[in-house]
Amino acid sequence: PGPPPGPPRVSPDPRAELDSTVLLTRSLLADTRQLAAQLRDKFPADGDHNLDSLPTLAMSAGALGALQLPGVLTRLRADLLSYLRHVQWLRRAGGSSLKTLEPELGTLQARLDRLLRRLQLLMSRLALPQPPPDPPAPPLAPPSSAWGGIRAAHAILGGLHLTLDWAVRGLLLLKTRL
């Protein structure tokens, strides 16, 4: 006979797992909020800015009560992957004006990446079905001008801020239900 089986793997407490994900999300929300304020100070926004390639906001007012954990985590992961791609694009193609937001944009990218890894881990720990690998996204066109890069930055940081606020709300509520 083969070697004796090891001790059974203790399943981590899902509430504790979710709790640390909430805290990481709140931490990223704080970073995003600070960076968006910094951007507004340097380059005041004239109204709302949109970018067609950004994900649409995952929810509206009435939807919180109906949230289920698998749906929230899957949607959040997909949206954050899109924002990660947009932040990478912004750092690469955003133009010299946005260089003034470094190293903060780099830090934001690293923390976004960390949260995505955390979500992946949480989904596997909770034995949630893993989403299929994302199809390669079409490359993002470089901004048409320096001002286009700044408008894109407003849209990306504003959208990420709302997505993270929504995520914190959803995750906090789901944690109370576990």
Epitope: D19, S20, L23, L24, R26, S27, L29, A30, R33, L57, M59, S60, A61, G62, A63, L64, L162, D165, W166, V168, R169, L172, L173, K175, T176
Partner: antibody, heavy 119, light 111 residues
Amino acid sequence: EVQLVQSGAEVKKPGASVKISCKASGYTFTDYNMDWVKQAPGQRLEWIGDINPTIGAPIYNQKFTGRATLTVDKSASTAYMELSSLRSEDTAVYYCARGELAHWYFDVWGQGTTVTVSS
Amino acid sequence: DIVLTQSPASLALSPGERATLSCRASKSVSTEGYSYIHWYQQKPGQAPRLLIYLASNLESGVPARFSGSGSGTDFTLTISSLEEEDFATYYCQHSRDLPPTFGQGTKLEIK
């Protein structure tokens, strides 16, 4: 000057509802969430809930779920809290306060609205 | 819910003296590089006013005689030299989790 101005005092009968308004000025209304806090006589402050003015999506203290309803009118930079099925224990001062979910402290407060529930 | 216990319930001191107010949480409120404790001052008939956020950060416009410290479950608000206008009730609040809760308050009175 950043300000939150609340509606006036209310006297209600048990079982009735009350709706309090909170008008924000001096900052971009959608840049912060709006929280509501209860202060009953001789009791500690109690958080009721929080709403994001851009997406709505309120979250509530479980103690108030089902009785408190938070809404906003973005165009008027005004937040509302409605409390239904009033009872004597709801007699309190209710505050709106500016907050955000990242750190969740309240840096600007309304002046408070006194709600008295009495038959 | 996390319970915050403030001590003492009341404190009588004279202007110029140092005040030390305590807030103890029923579980740790420090994590991910933050201590999620905030301090407020409230005077009779007025709304609370934020003094300190995230345990030790002084809110804009608050005099430097106010300071906050602590981590984990034990936090302190210190007023280095009391002024007449500091006599009020002080509350701590945590924001570590849903729902945020407040301590029962410490009333600072003139001796």
